[in-house]
């Protein structure tokens, strides 16, 4: 070894998603999601790992409960910084109904259109975050099949908070949210004990999303 050789400490950067993906996050905004800022903290931690731009990853957000709102489209923002600012400002829309099938179907039919910024030939990813059984679960099977037919990769997250608060069985709920996730389920489905724990899955979720373009 040369006498001039030096050991230099270096820090590996946080893994970033610098690939081309169109990601639509579908958020349950019904009243039972509490506290809401746990959701915005989760969004912040997930989005700051992404390299967002018109030629990189694009992110859109849809919020649903009794009805559906497009918080912002895939092509609305052209940098990670802009998306982070917008995501922080998303307010909970409320409502007692959890129309999960409607939320997913609206994301598929509307959020993933070219008019809203979806790009031809770019992999579509949907992340669904919810805390309760859907009130329109009779539609869920068909809606998921429609996503499958359009090659939309789905990650689903079950928040068990409202079930734990009411000491209710989570079995039926977990099965429903598992059915939303793409195969293999164990790589596309997550569950957290409550809203505060959402941030604990960000790293793994991020890595699995990024792996889609590996």
């Amino acid at each position: 070894v040369s006498p001039t050789f030096q050991v230099v400490n270096s820090i590996a950067p946080v893994q970033e998603c610098s690939t081309q993906l169109d990601i639509v996050i579908v958020l349950d905004g019904s009243n039972s999601i509490y506290p809401w800022d746990s959701v915005t903290a989760f969004l912040n931690d997930l989005l700051e790992r992404m390299d967002i731009g018109p030629k990189q990853t694009q992110v859109g957000i849809v919020q649903y409960g009794e009805n559906v709102t497009h918080e912002f489209n895939l092509n609305k923002y052209s940098s990670t910084e802009e998306v982070l600012v917008a995501a922080k400002k998303i307010v909970q829309r409320g409502g007692r109904q959890t129309m999960t099938a409607l939320g997913i179907d609206t994301a598929r039919k509307e959020a993933f259109t070219e008019a809203r910024g979806a790009r031809r030939g770019v992999k579509k990813v949907m992340v669904i975050v919810t805390d309760g059984e859907s009130h329109d679960n009779h539609r869920l099977k068909k809606v998921i099949q429609d996503c499958e037919d359009e090659n939309i990769q789905r990650f689903s997250i079950a928040i068990l908070g409202s079930y734990n608060r009411g000491n209710l069985s989570t079995e039926k709920f977990v099965e429903e949210i598992k059915s939303i996730a793409s195969e293999p389920t164990e790589k596309h489905f997550f569950n957290v004990s409550d809203e505060l724990a959402l941030v604990t899955i960000v790293k793994t979720l991020g890595e699995r999303i990024f792996a889609l373009e590996a």
């Epitope: 829309r93 409320g94 409502g95 608060r165 009411g166």
Partner: antibody, heavy 124, light 108 residues
Framework: EVQLVQSGAEVKKPGESLRISCKGS????????IGWVRQMPGKGLEWMGI????????RYSPSFQGQVTISADKSISTAYLQWSSLKASDTAMYYC??????????????????WGQGTLVTVS | EIVLTQSPGTLSLSPGERATLSCRAS???????LAWYQQKPAQAPRLLIY???RRATGIPDRFSGSGSGTDFTLTISRLEPEDFAVYYC?????????FGQGTTVEIK
């Protein structure tokens, strides 16, 4: 901007009936629970009950069950608190407040993030 | 129902001083579902803190909440003239809402 605007002060005699109101704006009023809170002169805050204007589902504090009626008219984004027969001990400031949280099934939780300006009710 | 006891009843301090307000519950408050409100004379209460330690929108960072189980604290790191008011704690983990009796922070 989220706002809860309450009706004006009332002076009533014992035995009379009364209905006070709380009109919400700046958010989807039918999608959030509205609570009512009493504050007697020089005293602290007491939760009375809560209503979901979307379907008028109502919960009462045991202390106020049967003493008051909480209702809502979702078409005009308004919640109401009413008495059929007022007593001198009903003299107080009454506040409405929006619940950030839920009260579905048997479980209620959440904090009150926006409050009305209060309605002073005097019974004498 | 859960009874909340606030102490002291009155706190006499000067602007710039640190205020520490206590709220003790008669039984454990689930998920740290405890909030703090500020009320000034002839005004409605204003939300300061929820889930024991989260600041509400627009609340200055001199206000902080801590605690879990049965013991909770609201701290005002450096009192400003506008902070002299009555402070209430409130629990909401038992399908009803109960408030403490209040702590008055007055100018010394």
């Amino acid at each position: 901007e989220v706002q809860l605007v309450q009706s004006g002060a009332e002076v009533k005699k014992p035995g009379e009936s009364l209905r006070i109101s709380c009109k919400g704006s700046g958010y989807s009023v039918t999608s959030y629970w509205i609570g009512w809170v009493r504050q007697m002169p020089g005293k602290g805050l007491e939760w009375m009950g809560i209503i979901y204007p979307g379907d008028s589902d109502t919960r009462y504090s045991p202390s106020f069950q049967g003493q008051v009626t909480i209702s809502a008219d979702k078409s005009i984004s308004t919640a109401y608190l009413q008495w059929s027969s007022l007593k001198a001990s009903d003299t107080a400031m009454y506040y409405c407040a929006r619940l950030q949280g839920d009260c579905s099934g048997g479980t209620c939780y959440g904090h009150f993030d926006y409050w009305g300006q209060g309605t002073l009710v005097t019974v004498s | 129902e859960i009874v909340l006891t606030q102490s002291p009843g009155t706190l006499s301090l000067s602007p710039g001083e640190r205020a520490t307000l206590s709220c003790r519950a008669s039984q454990s408050v689930s998920s740290s579902y405890l909030a703090w409100y500020q009320q000034k004379p002839a005004q409605a209460p204003r939300l300061l803190i929820y889930v024991a330690s989260r600041r509400a929108t627009g609340i200055p960072d001199r206000f902080s909440g801590s605690g879990s189980g049965t013991d909770f604290t609201l701290t005002i790191s450096r009192l400003e003239p506008e902070d002299f008011a009555v402070y209430y704690c409130q629990q909401y983990g038992t399908s009803s809402w109960t408030f403490g009796q209040g702590t008055t922070v007055e100018i010394k």
